[in-house]
Amino acid sequence: LIIGFGISGKHFITVTTFTSAGNIGEDGTLSCTFEPDIKLNGIVIQWLKEGIKGLVHEFKEGKDDLSQQHEMFRGRTAVFADQVVVGNASLRLKNVQLTDAGTYTCYIRTSKGKGNANLEYKTGAFSMPEINVDYNASSESLRCEAPRWFPQPTVAWASQVDQGANFSEVSNTSFELNSENVTMKVVSVLYNVTINNTYSCMIENDIAKATGDIKVTDSEVKRRSQLQLLNSG
């Protein structure tokens, strides 16, 4: 969370940004809020990126002004016009690229004053893992798969019964490059699993942490997975 203040004469407005992460190939949001202003035609929103000449996006007099937009962002940005009224200057970024990572500035001007705040935008790939029982193996094993990760993550297994146990000796993890030659498919197999136990497959890089849980009993298999972005908020 970054809060910036701007001063214009006696007036300053608070601008707040949230560090966020973009999943390459998907759409992302760079979050920014400001003190709402009743005079809508005086609201100017500018998004800038460190090291880039020109603007990422500009919204003024009620519409987008893309005359100074840098070509790497052409056709990929939008603000949520109906949210500007309530002080939301967040930027939608389509088809996130690895090169979109960096420091962005959300600059706001209203009839009350001006202000800005910076935002660190990380890019990578992250996806939810799915764990399945691998019945083909000679001994009962679990297979944890996640289709897209970048940078290369670490993978660790944990068990509810054997808490603190190190499963690296009884697991095998592989990373397979996807067709676009950036992201990788993560596959990890855990061997010698026991029934009536809950196992967790944890995949983590510097952008996200994902966990898949599986509980295997005689009668059923229960699965749960979650994904958490790191250093966000």
Epitope: E35, I38, L40, G62, A81, V84, V85
Partner: antibody, heavy 116, light 107 residues
Framework: QVQLVQSGAEVKKPGSSMRVSCKAS????????ISWVRQAPGQGLEWMGG????????NYAQKFQGRVTITADKSTSTAYMELSSLRSEDTAVYYC?????????WGQGTLVTVSS | EIVMTQSPASLSVSPGERATLSCRAS??????LAWYQQKPGQAPRLLIY???TRATGIPARVSGGGSGTEFTLTISSLQSEDFAVYYC?????????FGPGTKLEIK
């Protein structure tokens, strides 16, 4: 001097529609949103929705979604609020106001009575 | 939606005294809160926006405070024209929502 002038009082039958107009100054229309707020007899204020002609956006409260339509005619600087499928609970004073996010000038109000 | 509550529902105060009205939001609205005064048969009048900024023409004896979920409107040295109903309104998120009002009466 900012002024919002609304159309006159109406009596409507249940099931019918109502349409209230709100004439504003040109500056108000080009620079601000126009919202609609209603007040049932002896009750509090209830935001129905609003339009920001400069942004080309309109938002409605969930409660009225599908039953209310807010439009803006830039050429005459007039906003309209239409409410369909009227019922007795819609009897209220309907106000137009300059804003959101907050409302600094209000129309005089239009009393709409829904009765059979 | 964000639910606004106000307390007390009614308040009896003598002229010349101070009145403090409270408004609570069901979730944080930062400082995105406005206060209105309404007299019988009249449209509401904006008093405060941004939780603490007085609207044009509002006297200094009217002040607003608070942020997040708890807000107050204080009127010091009450005058006859101050007796009315007061509403708070959040504008952090759509839909904009009002509190049920506090009726300020002469004691």
């Amino acid at each position: 001097q900012v002024q919002l002038v609304q159309s006159g009082a109406e009596v409507k039958k249940p099931g019918s529609s109502m349409r209230v107009s709100c004439k504003a100054s040109e500056d108000t229309f080009s620079s601000y949103a126009i919202s609609w707020v209603r007040q049932a007899p002896g009750q509090g204020l209830e935001w129905m929705g609003g339009t920001a002609p400069i942004f080309g956006t309109t938002n409605y409260a969930q409660k009225f979604q599908g039953r209310v339509t807010i439009t803006a005619d830039k050429s005459t600087s007039t906003a309209y609020m239409e409410l369909s499928s009227l019922r007795s609970e819609d009897t209220a004073v309907y106000y137009c106001a300059r804003g959101g996010p907050y409302f600094d000038y209000w129309g005089q109000g239009t009393l709409v009575t829904v009765s059979s | 939606e964000i639910v606004m509550t106000q307390s007390p529902a009614s308040l009896s105060v003598s002229p010349g005294e101070r009145a403090t009205l409270s408004c609570r939001a069901s979730q944080s609205v930062s400082s995105n809160l406005a206060w209105y005064q309404q007299k019988p048969g009249q449209a509401p009048r904006l008093l405060i926006y941004g939780a603490s900024t007085r609207a044009t023409g509002i006297p200094a004896r009217v002040s607003g405070g608070g942020s997040g979920t708890e807000f107050t409107l204080t009127i010091s040295s009450l005058q006859s024209e101050d007796f009315a109903v007061y509403y708070c309104q959040q504008y952090k998120n759509w839909p904009f929502t009002f509190g049920p009002g506090t009726k300020l009466e002469i004691k």
